[in-house]
């Protein structure tokens, strides 16, 4: 009897949907695997007789529940199928946005870039999929624990009237208010402000 694949899970970030599993212990030899998805009541092969322990399902529709399954095979024998259900629009993890930061005197000017979606048009981003897409930004003085959060209305934001000659750190994540779902925070970007340009009267 061939044992089934173990630890089957869907690793999905920005709709890059990779079904992953682990090969079970099997004394007779090396196992191969077949992974399928349910399409109009019929299971279709996606990865056949592969020696890999993953299969790319990024071409699935982003909407609705998908049933995926994988089994192990050896010669003419095979294991039972292991099934999982996956809804990309609900289950994918939102990766960190890009961020450009520029210092202008005592202000930080930030521009945000929504994560790109692979296997789509070149310009297609997570913003195109989720109508409620917005950003959470948090910033803090470097070396302190007190943080300030803002929710920009647009793809850019300006932090004004900061302390001069002080290093501020900023990070951003995508946020979906209608789903109360947040994405991964970007790596912090830290920049030092310069002098206050206001002229005394």
């Amino acid at each position: 009897m061939v044992p089934p694949p173990e630890n089957v899970r869907m690793n999905s970030v920005n709709f890059k949907n990779i079904l992953q599993w682990e090969s079970p212990a099997f004394a007779k030899g090396n196992l191969t695997f077949t992974a399928q998805y349910l399409s109009y009541r019929i299971f279709q092969d996606k990865c056949m007789n592969t020696t890999l322990t993953e299969c790319d399902f990024s071409s699935l529709s982003k909407y609705g529940d998908h049933t995926l399954r994988v089994r192990a095979e050896f010669a003419d024998e095979h294991s039972d199928w292991v099934n999982i259900t996956f809804c990309p629009v609900d289950d994918t993890i939102i990766g960190p946005p890009g961020m450009q930061v520029e210092v202008l005197a005592d202000s930080l000017h930030m521009r945000f870039l929504a994560p790109k979606i692979e296997n789509e048009y070149e310009t297609w981003t997570m913003k195109n999929v989720y109508n409620s897409w917005t950003y959470n930004v948090q910033y803090w003085k470097n070396g302190t624990d007190e943080k300030f959060q803002i929710t920009p209305q647009y793809d850019f934001e300006v932090l004004r009237n900061l302390e001069p000659w002080t290093t501020y750190c900023v990070q951003v994540r995508g946020f979906l208010p209608d789903r109360n779902k947040a994405g991964e925070w970007s790596e912090p970007v830290c920049e030092q402000t310069t002098h206050d340009e206001t002229v005394p009267s």
Epitope: G95, W140, D145, R173, K181, P188
Partner: nanobody
Framework: QVQLQESGGGSVQAGGSLRLSCTVS????????MGWFRQAPGKEREGVAT????????YYANSVKGRFTISRDNAKNTAYLQMNSLKPEDTAMYYC??????????????????RGQGTQVTVSS
Amino acid sequence: QVQLQESGGGSVQAGGSLRLSCTVSRYTASVNYMGWFRQAPGKEREGVATIFTGAGTTYYANSVKGRFTISRDNAKNTAYLQMNSLKPEDTAMYYCAVDFRGGLLYRPAYEYTYRGQGTQVTVSS
């Protein structure tokens, strides 16, 4: 430097429950992933559970699935591991771990950048 403080370990009879807590302090960036791993004497480290703090997405080792639940309170920078139906083979030192990087939901927590000192869980039959 990031500091992690675990609590909630102890001794319990088989079938009992414990709730572990892990609080992150002195951090300089928001945590994307929090998790727990364990190590029993003479055995290899084992990832137990991880959580993506943004959406609350969770992942469990097969050995604890259905018995353990990981959760988080982002406002308190705290992760919890509710352990029910404990078995003698769950006896181990349990460690909390966190990471600020992305894409780590399915990585065992012992691979995370910051780890706590651990809290002992002993389950007797």
